[in-house]
Interface confidence: low
Amino acid sequence: QDVVDLDFFTQQPLHLVSPSFLSVTIDANLATDPRFLIFLGSPKLRTLARGLSPAYLRFGGTKTDFLIFDPKKESTFEERSYWQSQVNQDICKSGSIPPDVEEKLRSEWPYQEQVLLREHYQKKFKNSTYSRSSVDMLYTFANCSGLDLIFGLNALLRTADLQWNSSNAQLLLDYCSSKRYNMSWELGNEPNSFLKKADIFINGSQLGEDFIQLHKLLRKSTFKNAKLYGPDVGQPRRKTAEMLKSFLKAGGEVIDSVTWHHYYLNGRTATEEDFLNPDVLDIFISSVQKVFQVVESTRPGKKVWLGETSSAYGGGAPLLSDTFAAGFMWLDKLGLSARMGIEVVMRQVFFGAGNYHLVDENFDPLPDYWLSLLFKKLVGTKVLMASVKGPKRRNLRVYLHCTNTDNPMYKEGDLTLYAINLYNVTKYLRLPYPFFDKQVDKYLLRPLGPHGLLSKAVQLNGQTLKMVDDQTLPPLMEKPLRPGSSLGLPAFSYSFFVIRNAKVAAC
């Protein structure tokens, strides 16, 4: 019973996801003290970000609605030092952060991280201002890493009658126009909880009107075709779903995609068992369905994006969200999102406070980074269907796409299967006719070292994954399997399998 037969549906794609399907975020809280945005000047961090291109980089989060642009604000000493060090360089071939500045910021970061997490848990948010330098830092990081920046504007700037006050946004738009910064926009973050965060209640219809106002501003700016995404609501519980519905009725016409957020767990209470529980993974399905119900009943056919998502909210689950164990949730969410028609999934966060980052405070990639990198290289935009034959197989989760056609190793018509084994025994997957005798390349991820699933290091087909140097990612080496053999998937592991020469016409 450890041999499992698979079923494929390959006649036509179920969905077509964006080439930027797997995207990332930088939490707006990184700008609370704008000096820490200098971290984005790290060549190593940029190398890692480039590995995930094409992707969106969303700058947003709770702090979005507590940040105010001040074009007259002076840069800090650290920011001036950074820009001074870059003066004679090609902006994208940046030298490193000045060593004294980096050392100072690194030593202060643990304290700053605690400040940010405490602010989040206590739900006491203070307004902060950011300067032109902060905008430059963000845009340069995105642009030099091949990422498309999406900037979240403060939606809590209100007139006396609760209309959105767009004057601060206008200042930022004017600055970005002057610099020829080409980016997309959002307005507000999780407006469903404004009452809790700021004692202000904004209903969906009002928010829709606010988006219409922002849309008009964008049409008047240099970038008439700038995209606008929203409303970045939280999970679709009853009141949030109602808010989304009334927002879409009022303002849905002016947004390019509908954005919402999802977390499985509370980071403070999550356990290792939760991270490996198929019941927990399955709750995502009903959340997606509810969002689609609302969208289809108000703006049929409008694209749906996960605008912010991770394993656990509140910065993630300590000792879990940054380990190999987090990959089960991340890969399953990517698979389900693609299968269910979500066009883009934005991972909270690429780099920043908490435990759910892809890259840690030393700019070292964590297991979910390597998983994301493999996904980018192997998984294409055309979504097919794989399923496990037989009942009660939720511990074995399989997803199927056409292979990424940008990968020079593979060709059109090839298939990428990715699979998650939550059983405590190895499972052997058998491909269906006519694929069972094809050449298959295996990319198996396993944790490295004594910490097992809680390891922060990972092996690909038995080889430890680490950067060659700050400018170079390692080759991702396949393991060719003997044609006709079953695909072994060890207990509590995940893997990609590329089926070569599959000749699937839909691909």
Epitope: D282, S286, K290, G301, G341, K392
Partner: antibody, heavy 123, light 112 residues
Framework: QVQLVESGGGVVQPGRSLRLSCAAS????????MHWVRQAPGKGLEWVAV????????YYADSVKGRFTISRDNSKNTLNLQMNSLRAEDTAVYYC????????????????WGQGTTVTVSS | YIVMTQSPLSLPVTPGEPASISCRSS???????????LDWYLQKPGQSPQLLIY???NRASGVPDRFSGSGSGTDFTLKINRVEAEDVGVYYC?????????FGQGTRLEIK
């Protein structure tokens, strides 16, 4: 294996009530929408009602609206159809069917059917 | 609601010969996602209906490849390229685009 088994049919007088049940097994019941479809003797198929995976939405054919109620108990993997104010024209074999739209909530179709239970409304 | 009309209502066929059933809807079944929300079902004598084709042209699991569905918008066709004795029964088309869900009247396929 995936299975749906209807029960609760029988002979009942016009104006009376009857409750049909459908027991599901072999799949994650709580992830799927479920339908009732009926077939009068010698006639074609007629859709009766659908309920979404979580019970949040229910839709009915005009011919049964206000008289029939579809419900589900996800903890017991059971689908129900409460039929009140029965009429002679409700005489039919009643089938429950699974909606494959677990990943496309708006897809109404039936990929698995039960064997049916017969309801006869007669005085 | 959407009215589904099938033709012919009766279809006698010689084994090994092809068969074709037409289904027309009173409004388009093409969803904004590019799929036609039309299914074909077969009800064999004394049995429950079974799904043959979903979303206009996709064969359901376990359905022989002699069955195929085609069409878009309002006009759809179910083809059997070589009828076998086990294919007898009543074939129904059904629109799955919106509630109330509606079926065609059925086409009875019998062996000559």
């Amino acid at each position: 294996q995936v299975q749906l088994v209807e029960s609760g049919g029988g002979v009942v007088q016009p104006g009376r009530s009857l409750r049909l049940s459908c027991a599901a097994s072999g799949f994650t019941f709580s992830s799927y929408g479920m339908h009732w479809v009926r077939q009068a003797p010698g006639k074609g198929l007629e859709w009766v009602a659908v309920i979404w995976y979580d019970g949040s939405n229910k839709y009915y054919a005009d011919s049964v609206k206000g008289r029939f109620t579809i419900s589900r108990d996800n903890s017991k993997n059971t689908l129900n159809l409460q039929m009140n104010s029965l009429r002679a024209e409700d005489t039919a074999v009643y089938y429950c069917g699974r909606d494959p739209g677990t990943y496309h909530y708006y897809y109404h179709g039936m990929d698995v059917w039960g064997q049916g239970t017969t309801v006869t409304v007669s005085s | 609601y959407i009215v589904m009309t099938q033709s012919p209502l009766s279809l006698p066929v010689t084994p090994g010969e092809p068969a074709s059933i037409s289904c027309r809807s009173s409004q388009s079944l093409l969803h904004s996602n590019g799929y036609n929300f039309l299914d074909w079902y077969l009800q064999k004598p004394g049995q429950s209906p079974q799904l043959l084709i979903y979303l206009g042209s996709n064969r359901a699991s376990g359905v022989p490849d002699r069955f195929s569905g085609s069409g878009s918008g309002t006009d759809f066709t179910l083809k059997i390229n070589r009828v076998e004795a086990e294919d007898v029964g009543v074939y129904y088309c059904m629109q799955a685009l919106q509630t109330p869900i509606t079926f065609g009247q059925g086409t009875r396929l019998e062996i000559k």
